[in-house]
């Protein structure tokens, strides 16, 4: 199903807050089309906060959302605003900080039960072999039980990011998952399109590293929606 495809790349078991590998995952698509469950573990402070113009949530960092800076303000003037913490009022999931979602107008803990990870890739391939039913490959974030083995190095087989060493995440490479490097500043990253795509993304990038978020490059703002380039940028 399309939902299976949309969920096919969520990265399981991102590192806990302030521990392990860089834990700054992006937003991911939920099982319900068009609904975003922000993921991740890091709360952004508003120190040195620079207004960043935007038209949609995807253009903001994973711990930001796009809205008018003043209540009831001009909808045409929108900037990336710091996410709203637990128990704060919200109107949609993207407003809530990573690890939370919007329920009945209040940001509540997602309790590790929703998809996480900035993981849709740029290469899309519609294929027509005997697997063309697009097997369900949904991936949910859960906190791992005790580590049972040495953590994998780059290229190692994995099922979730906790299987990988610090600085790596577990991501799709063709039809299996391997440990890949967490993205550094300036590297191209991938933002989920909430409406998804009709192909199957067969490669995944990791999320951006600590202190970085996946944003559209300023010089690409004028480009068409389909070709806008996102890179890992400092908050």
């Amino acid at each position: 199903t399309l939902n299976s495809v949309l969920n096919s790349n969520a990265i399981k078991n991102l590192p806990p807050p302030l521990g392990g590998a860089a834990g700054h995952p992006g937003s991911a698509v939920s099982a319900a089309p068009g609904i975003l469950y922000p993921g991740g573990n890091k709360y952004q402070t508003i120190d040195n906060y620079q207004p960043y113009p935007c038209a949609e949530d995807e253009e903001c960092g994973t711990d930001e959302y796009c809205a008018s800076p003043t209540r009831g303000g001009d909808a045409g003037v929108q900037i990336c605003l710091a996410c709203r913490k637990r128990r704060k009022r919200c109107m949609r999931h993207a407003m809530c900080c990573p690890g939370n979602y919007c329920k009945n107008g209040i940001c509540v803990s997602s309790d590790q039960n929703h998809f996480r990870g900035e993981i849709e890739e740029t290469i899309t391939e519609s294929f027509g072999n005997d697997h063309s039913t697009l097997d369900g490959y949904s991936r949910r974030t859960t906190l791992s039980s005790k580590m049972y083995h040495t953590k994998g190095q780059e290229g190692s087989v994995c099922l979730r990011s906790s299987d990988c060493a610090s600085g790596l995440c577990c991501a799709r490479h063709f039809w299996s998952k391997i440990c890949k490097p967490v993205l550094k500043e300036g590297q191209v990253c991938t933002k989920h399109r909430r409406k998804g795509s009709h192909g199957l993304e067969i490669f995944q990038r990791c999320y951006c590293g600590e202190g970085l978020s996946c944003r559209i490059q300023k010089d690409h703002h004028q480009a068409s929606n389909s070709s806008r380039l996102h890179t890992c940028q400092r908050h």
Epitope: K12, G136, Y137, T142, W175, S176, I178, C179
Partner: antibody, heavy 117, light 107 residues
Framework: EVQLLQSAAEVKRPGESLRISCKTS????????MHWVRQMPGKELEWMGG????????SYNQKFKGHVTISVDKSSSTAYLQWSSLKASDAAMYYC??????????WGQGTLVTVSS | DIVLTQSPASLAVSPGQRATITCITS??????MNWYQQKPGQPPKLLIS???TLRPGVPARFSSSGSGTDFTLTINPVEANDVANYYC?????????FGQGTKLEIK
């Protein structure tokens, strides 16, 4: 058609070395992780470990780590499972299985390993 | 490691009837469960993969349900050639772990 063809049955003595193989065809070998699974006589299946041919990265079940080595030869699209010193308890059927989005979709026919003094 | 407790160990079902096999996991694995059929002298065959997805070529008589910790494989109606061992496999967390197996016999 995807095929995984495993090497023939082996009869060995304890302490001997052994390498069994799994030759693949019908798909791009480097695009899928290859797993090895053990089935002792009349018992359930046990995942031993896997290797992704792209960079040769492996992961092992702790139960088997240090006792077996998983490797690949990309030029011949073949995966290997190797023991440097067999034990009597290694007697079992061994399967290679291709990974497809987390599941093991295609399996070899199995290699029966007998270890007897 | 995640422990999979499969039951029953064996069951006998009349042709045309329903067979139900359950698998309970020691921790929540969402819907990352797979089901296999293994006939004597053969390797396991994947019936159903993650997300309760029926594999291409597998008859619709086979179905699965469940998420979290409780999973069920249902064969309805059972046919004579369904005699086999059935295994569940979790693919949520390394190491992959299998259930102990269920032997299906025909009455």
């Amino acid at each position: 058609e995807v095929q995984l063809l495993q090497s023939a049955a082996e009869v060995k003595r304890p302490g001997e070395s052994l390498r069994i193989s799994c030759k693949t065809s019908g798909y791009s070998f480097t695009e899928n992780t290859m797993h090895w699974v053990r089935q002792m006589p009349g018992k359930e299946l046990e995942w031993m470990g896997g290797i992704n041919p792209h960079k040769g990265g492996t992961s092992y079940n702790q139960k088997f780590k240090g006792h077996v080595t998983i490797s690949v030869d990309k030029s011949s699209s073949t995966a290997y499972l190797q023991w440097s010193s067999l034990k009597a308890s290694d007697a079992a059927m061994y399967y290679c299985a291709r990974d497809w989005l987390g599941a093991m979709d295609y399996w070899g026919q199995g290699t029966l390993v007998t270890v007897s003094s | 490691d995640i422990v999979l407790t499969q039951s029953p160990a064996s069951l006998a079902v009349s042709p045309g009837q329903r067979a139900t096999i359950t698998c309970i996991t020691s921790t929540d694995i969402d819907d990352d469960m797979n089901w296999y059929q293994q006939k004597p002298g053969q390797p396991p065959k994947l019936l159903i993969s993650e997300g309760n997805t029926l594999r291409p070529g597998v008859p619709a008589r086979f179905s699965s349900s469940g998420s979290g910790t409780d999973f069920t494989l249902t064969i309805n109606p059972v046919e004579a050639n369904d005699v086999a061992n059935y295994y569940c496999l979790q693919s949520d967390n390394l190491p992959y772990t299998f259930g102990q197996g269920t032997k299906l016999e025909i009455k």
